[in-house]
């Protein structure tokens, strides 16, 4: 049995999420569970720091992209949303909230604005943006 989850505000098209093929969860109520990750889209616009705080308050973090295979549903995300990728001026690296460094070839980085934070957009693209610019955001929780 497959559950057709269609979130018009988040995805470009209908996203099929398996319910019985393998157990996924637990996730907070109304979050999407997919391949051992919980995701939620928040459509209120906040700057990066406020978005991070919002995710943390729900025991989650901003979206971390770590695998094109495990996170293939992200291909279909529409518009732009804050993710947990930031530039660290002290060492010049781009890293995730957990301190891990951005893996090469995982995201196509577009230097859209002069900033130190990044927005996620469809097809594994990251758009550099000023951290103080308000945007919608995606929170993520690992289930394992």
């Amino acid at each position: 049995i497959w559950s057709a989850v269609f979130l018009n505000s988040l995805f470009n098209q209908e996203v099929q999420i398996p319910l019985t093929e393998s157990y996924c969860g637990p996730c907070p109520k109304n979050w999407i569970c997919y391949k051992n990750n919980c995701y939620q889209f928040f459509d209120e616009s906040k700057n990066w720091y406020e978005s991070q705080a919002s995710c943390m308050s729900q025991n989650a973090s901003l979206l971390k992209v770590y695998s094109k295979e495990d996170q293939d549903l992200l291909k279909l995300v529409k518009s732009y949303h804050w993710m947990g990728l930031v530039h660290i001026p002290t060492n010049g690296s781009w890293q995730w909230e957990d301190g891990s460094i951005l893996s090469p070839n995982l995201l196509t980085i577009i230097e859209m604005q002069k900033g130190d934070c990044a927005l996620y957009a469809s097809s594994f693209k990251g758009y550099i943006e000023n951290c103080s610019t308000p945007n919608t955001y995606i929170c993520m929780q690992r289930t394992v």
């Epitope: 010049g92 859209m112 604005q113 900033g115 130190d116 550099i128």
Partner: antibody
């Protein structure tokens, strides 16, 4: 190899118009800010302006804002500089350049075009 | 606009000499993000300019370590520890902190 190939330069009469082009190879221009800089004979480099990847932000040198229009066509991987009401002092070698803004640690011009010469004369 | 003043405009050297070029900005070029976007470019005869130094003191990839940048606020310096023939050309300082961005007038490094 990353290259920015420029064209469109030449002789133009005072008061006339000209459009310079910059075509990229080995690089996807749609990911980067691009700039134009010129060097007049016997003078130094002068920054004209810059444009961001989706053309939502374009910055010009105020003294040149009414003379130049910077645009881009990401589908064709090209950058353009429209010149209008040219005068003799616009005679120069014009460069298109990629400017990196890869986080606040990395702001710089790293790939320069071949340059194209514009001569304003009657 | 930020005026970038380079000195000297001409610098005659012998190969192996140390060379020093000064660049002064008419106001602070510390960006609101705390960084100072002072860059140095070299234009050799018949070539497009090339990046040497960014953010005051960072050498760009492939630039020999005989090139070094220093300074802060409004006073900046480019030093070449031992000049080689391939170093001859016109050096420009550039500020990318405040729009409109501006170049110095250039310093011509030439043989005595």
């Amino acid at each position: 190899e990353v290259k920015l190939l420029q064209s469109g330069g030449g002789l133009v009469q005072p008061g006339g118009s000209l459009k310079l082009s910059c075509a990229a190879s080995g690089i996807d221009l749609s990911r980067y800010w691009m700039s134009w800089v010129r060097r007049a004979p016997g003078k130094g480099l002068e920054w004209i302006g810059e444009i961001n990847p989706d053309s939502s932000t374009i910055n010009y040198a105020p003294s040149l804002k009414d003379k130049f229009i910077i645009s881009r066509d990401n589908a064709k991987n090209t950058l353009s500089l429209q010149m209008r009401k040219v005068r003799s002092e616009d005679t120069a070698l014009y460069f298109c350049i990629r400017r990196r803004y890869y986080g606040s640690s990395y702001w710089y011009f790293d790939v320069w075009g071949t340059g194209t010469t514009v001569t304003v004369s009657s | 606009d930020v005026l970038m003043t380079q000195t000297p405009l001409s610098l005659p050297v012998s190969l192996g000499d140390q060379a020093s070029i000064s660049c002064r900005s008419s106001q602070s070029i510390v960006h609101t993000n705390g960084n100072t976007y002072l860059e140095w470019y070299l234009q050799k005869p018949g070539q497009s300019p090339k990046l040497l130094i960014y953010r005051v003191f960072n050498r760009f990839s492939g630039v020999p370590d005989r090139f070094s940048g220093s300074g802060s606020g409004t006073e900046f310096t480019l030093k070449i520890s031992r000049v080689e023939a391939e170093d001859l050309g016109v050096y420009y300082c550039f500020q990318g902190s405040h729009v409109p961005f501006t170049f110095g007038a250039g310093t011509k490094l030439e043989l005595k």
